[in-house]
């Protein structure tokens, strides 16, 4: 019997994520696979030999080699989650404990910027815990949470790059900034 | 539960490249930078830079921007870093660590110790 | 690149004493997370994102700060507190790390 630490899963809001079983293959042996959201002591879903596969609701889906697919996560599916695999002899072959954590996708960051104080902004609006990084002709400036301010004074031309991202996505906008000798918008 | 291996130690000749690797379980690979961080015997920590296993983007510090390659590979959810054209300075317990801006570098590997000696 | 100047280098204290080090930054930073390393061992996070104790980071700890002065505390010293506290900022690229606290045990 193997019990190991939670396996930490990160997963976005609004996707699907699939818990696949580590270091496990599916055989004739096997005989109920169950899967059990801890918080509530609930189970979610089971695979039994010769038996119509349980699924607690739609949004859960078993496949046969033990992966349970989670469909458009939801804050609420933030859990730990437990998978007992048994063989035909009833005896606990395998358990597997996920620490489930979703975040918001982070949204594509925008770039705004003026001539007159030759300064720039990057931001981005929508995400959970994002971090933004910000380049200036692929040579790394700054980073920070969800806003980054740059005055630059090395050339009116440049090709700025700005890279949002989290546990989950990530997501970056270039823009080519050119602005007139005398600094005007 | 969230593990970073690094092999034990390396010995190399002056002059030489190493590659040394990371090899990462119990989490999602994709979802942490990982990072380098140097410390010669009975001195403080120095990071030489991180890689996003997601995309591969890359940060530097200057001074090992020529030395060390940063690579990903995420069958085997392996980070790597070469270090070329060694010398004695280079001596030293090279790091993995992942780590986000608001977690900061959350697990460590056991370190490889390198040793650059004729 | 942001100088963390640690202070002091080394200390000394009798269990049950209140320690406090300091971790000072040549420009503003946001990010700040503090290291345990002892001898021969990995350095852990101890504190992160100013002042969130890593998990099974005792009670006694607490970190505070902000712009360019930042804090570790320990409550009341005991003996396998005896380590070296690195800080690290993570607001500016590079990533720097203090050169180290010291503490000692009398």
């Known amino acids: 019997k193997e019990i190991t630490n939670a396996l930490e899963t990160w997963g976005a809001l609004g996707q699907d994520i699939n818990l696949d079983i580590p270091s496990f293959q599916m055989s004739d042996d096997i005989d109920d696979i169950k899967w059990e959201k801890t918080s509530d002591k609930k189970k979610i879903a089971q695979f039994r030999k010769e038996k119509e596969t349980f699924k607690e609701k739609d949004t859960y889906k078993l496949f046969k080699n033990g992966t349970l697919k989670i469909k458009h996560l939801k804050t609420d599916d933030q859990d730990i989650y437990k998978v007992s695999i048994y063989d035909t002899k009833g005896k606990n072959v395998l358990e597997k404990i996920f620490d489930l954590k979703i975040q918001e996708r982070v949204s594509k960051p925008k770039i705004s910027w003026t001539c007159i104080n030759t300064t720039l902004t990057c931001e981005v609006m929508n995400g959970t815990d994002p971090e933004l990084n910000l380049y200036q002709d692929g040579k790394h400036l700054k980073l920070s949470q969800r806003v980054i301010t740059h005055k630059w004074t090395t050339s009116l031309s440049a090709k700025f790059k700005c890279t949002a991202g989290n546990k989950v996505s990530k997501e970056s906008s270039v823009e080519p900034v050119s602005c007139p000798e005398k600094g005007l918008d | 539960q969230v593990q970073l291996q690094q092999p034990g130690a390396e010995l190399v000749r002056p002059g030489a490249s190493v590659k040394l690797s990371c090899k990462a379980s119990g989490y999602t690979f994709t979802s942490y930078w990982m990072n380098w961080v140097k410390q010669r015997p009975e001195q403080g920590l120095e990071w030489i830079g991180r890689i996003d296993p997601h995309d591969s983007e890359t940060h530097y510090r200057q001074k090992f921007k020529d030395m060390a390659i940063l690579t990903v590979d995420k069958s085997s959810r392996t980070a790597y870093m070469q270090l070329s054209s060694l010398t004695s300075e280079d001596s030293a317990v090279y790091y993995c660590?992942?780590?986000?801006?608001?977690?900061?570098?959350?697990?460590w590997g056991q370190g490889t110790s390198v040793t650059v000696s004729s | 690149q942001i100088v963390l100047t640690q202070s002091p280098a080394i200390m000394s204290a009798s269990p049950g004493e209140k320690v406090t080090m300091t971790c000072r930054a040549s420009s503003s930073v946001s990010h700040m997370h503090w290291y345990q390393q002892k001898s021969g061992t990995s350095p852990k996070r101890w504190i992160y994102?100013?002042?969130k104790l890593a998990s099974g980071v005792p009670a006694r700890f607490s970190g505070s700060g902000s712009g360019t002065s930042y804090s570790l505390t320990i409550s009341s010293v005991e003996a396998e507190d005896a380590a070296t506290y690195y800080c690290?900022?993570?607001?500016?690229?590079?990533?720097?790390f203090g050169a180290g606290t010291k503490l000692e045990l009398k």
């Open positions: 994102d100013t002042s």
């Open positions: 660590a992942r780590g986000t801006m608001l977690d900061g570098m959350d697990y």
């Open positions: 690290q900022q993570w607001s500016s690229n590079p990533l720097t």
